[in-house]
């Protein structure tokens, strides 16, 4: 119960953050104007990884596309993939786990399966988290670095009569999306890895005992043991010789193909 | 088609409060638009006091912060103006206008003239 | 506050000829955002409000005629009216729609010579 629990809430904690990256690598506001001592302008600037836009007082909002590849900055190229895989492994991710989840019977798939799954799922919303963690990070970095360049350009050159005043850019609203998602998917990956553990049944260490009866020979393991610490070991109860008698988890009738729960 | 059109005393005693009213026809002042005033005085160049949005976030010109006060009244379809402290130095016209594209201003009352004596 | 410093205050042109009113500001009207110049230009007539021109420095307002135009960037800026006609005849304002408070020019009186 508490596994199913673990890896439902696994999964949707990551589906909320993959969708939040996604948000966020649509979302315009990337980088916004520092209004800094002027908190109302008549003319607002923000930008987006795909496009920047300008807030006029008068409520008009023009976007522009860049609609250029090579002509942009490296590092805006560098968020961009960051972003694109984050989103491609986290889709991949959630369609693995939904497959994988307990809750959900696929035919006669075995537990070692789910579990398996659980844990790809996991690894793949893992490196999504990071993945997006990482780009909003270096856009950040950007922005930092740009801002006190640009701070540094304010102060200098402004002994003539016109002054020309750079718009400096400061974190948007995207970012901290992009965190808490990326925050979501990692911390969503770990609980399906957390799951997995559960989902696999360990091999027991019990030595079989042999019991020398006058008809066949058999071997009887103690059966109804299902350890919860190995991660996706193929550990069903098998029988080791072809004798009458047959272990707890081959005498469980299998749901058949239709039977979803 | 968007019109205007400036409402108030044409005279004002100094030191007394200056009320004036544009009232918005032809459009919905909760259009999202900005709404500013704007006066001139007799002979001279324009000067930006200030706007209101519908939802009644202000903005006012430094110069006479201390002294405006723009309100709306949107069941009207009107906004106000109120200058006190008044001396003859703000006898001037008065237009109500509209911003558009470019923060540029299509849409004018015809004006106002008020008088600032004793 | 942006200063809007107009030249000539006035100026007299022979109908059919070439007007060009000059107007510059203290600082860059200039939005690198979305590579535009926020100044506009009116014309007033007396006994009436301004009418709008062009906006962005370059773009004529719809029902301006196209003998009206406007040109320049950053602090510099120019109206040009390419034939004088009788009725050009009034007072041109050029206006800082880039940060508050808006700022207007001093103007230019346009007469016939």
């Known amino acids: 119960m508490a596994v199913t629990a673990c890896q439902g809430l696994g999964f949707v904690v990551s589906l909320i953050g993959i969708a939040g990256i996604i948000a966020a690598t649509c979302m315009d506001q990337w980088s916004t104007q520092d209004l800094y001592n002027n908190p109302v302008t008549a003319v607002f600037n923000y930008q987006g990884l795909w496009r920047s836009c300008v807030r006029e007082s008068s409520g008009f909002t023009e976007c522009r596309g860049y609609f250029t590849l090579l002509g942009l900055p490296a590092m805006l190229q560098a968020v961009r993939a960051l972003m694109i895989v984050g989103i491609v492994l986290g889709a991949i991710g959630l369609l693995v786990s939904i497959f994988a989840l307990k809750c959900i019977r696929i035919g006669s798939m075995e537990d070692s399966a789910k579990a398996n799954m659980t844990l790809t799922s996991g690894i793949m919303f893992i490196v999504s988290g990071l993945c997006a963690i990482a780009g909003v990070s270096v856009f950040a970095n950007m922005l930092v670095t740009n801002f006190w360049m640009s701070t540094a350009n304010m102060y200098t050159g402004m002994g003539g009569m016109v002054q020309t005043v750079q718009t400096r850019y400061t974190f948007g609203a995207a970012l901290f999306v992009g965190w808490v998602a990326g925050g979501l998917t990692l911390i969503g990956g770990v609980m399906m890895c957390i799951a997995c553990r559960g989902l696999a049944p360990e091999e027991t260490n019990y030595k079989a005992v042999s019991y020398h009866a006058s008809g066949h020979s058999v071997a009887y393991k103690p059966g109804g043991f299902k350890a919860s610490t190995g991660f996706g070991s193929n550990t069903k109860n098998k029988k080791i010789y072809d004798g009458g008698a047959r272990t707890e988890d081959e005498v469980q009738s299998y749901p058949s193909k239709h039977d979803y729960v | 088609q968007v019109q205007l059109q400036e409402s108030g005393p044409g005279l004002v005693k100094p030191s007394q409060t200056l009320s004036l009213t544009c009232t918005v026809s032809?459009?919905?002042?909760?259009?999202?638009?900005?709404w500013h005033w704007i006066r001139q005085p007799p002979g001279k160049g324009l000067e930006w006091i200030g706007y209101?949005?519908?939802?009644?976030?202000?903005n006012y010109n430094p110069a006479l912060r201390s002294r405006v006060t723009i309100s709306v009244d949107t069941s009207k379809n009107q906004f106000s103006l109120k200058l006190s402290s008044v001396t003859a130095a703000d006898t001037a016209i008065y237009y109500c206008?509209?911003?558009?594209?470019?923060?540029?201003?299509?849409?004018w009352g015809q004006g106002t003239t008020v008088t600032v004596s004793s | 506050d942006i200063v809007m410093t107009q030249s000539p205050d006035s100026l007299a042109v022979s109908l059919g000829e070439r007007a060009t009113i000059n107007c510059k500001s203290s600082?860059?009207?200039?939005?690198?955002?979305?590579?535009?110049?926020?100044l506009t230009w009116y014309q007033q007539k007396p006994g009436q409000p301004p009418k709008l021109l062009i906006y962005?420095?370059?773009t004529r307002e719809s029902g301006v005629p196209d003998r009206f135009s406007g040109s320049g960037s950053g602090t510099d800026f120019t109206l040009t009216i390419s034939s004088l006609q009788a009725e050009d005849v009034a007072v041109y304002y050029c206006?800082?729609?880039?940060?508050?408070?808006?700022?207007f020019g001093g103007g230019t009186k346009l007469e016939i010579k």
């Open positions: 209101i949005h519908y939802t009644g976030s202000t």
């Open positions: 962005w420095a370059s």
């Open positions: 206006q800082n729609a880039y940060s508050f408070p808006y700022t």
């Open positions: 032809g459009g919905s002042i909760s259009s999202g638009y900005n």
């Open positions: 206008a509209r911003i558009y594209n470019g923060n540029s201003f299509p849409y």
């Open positions: 600082q860059s009207l200039f939005n690198s955002g979305n590579q535009k110049n926020y």
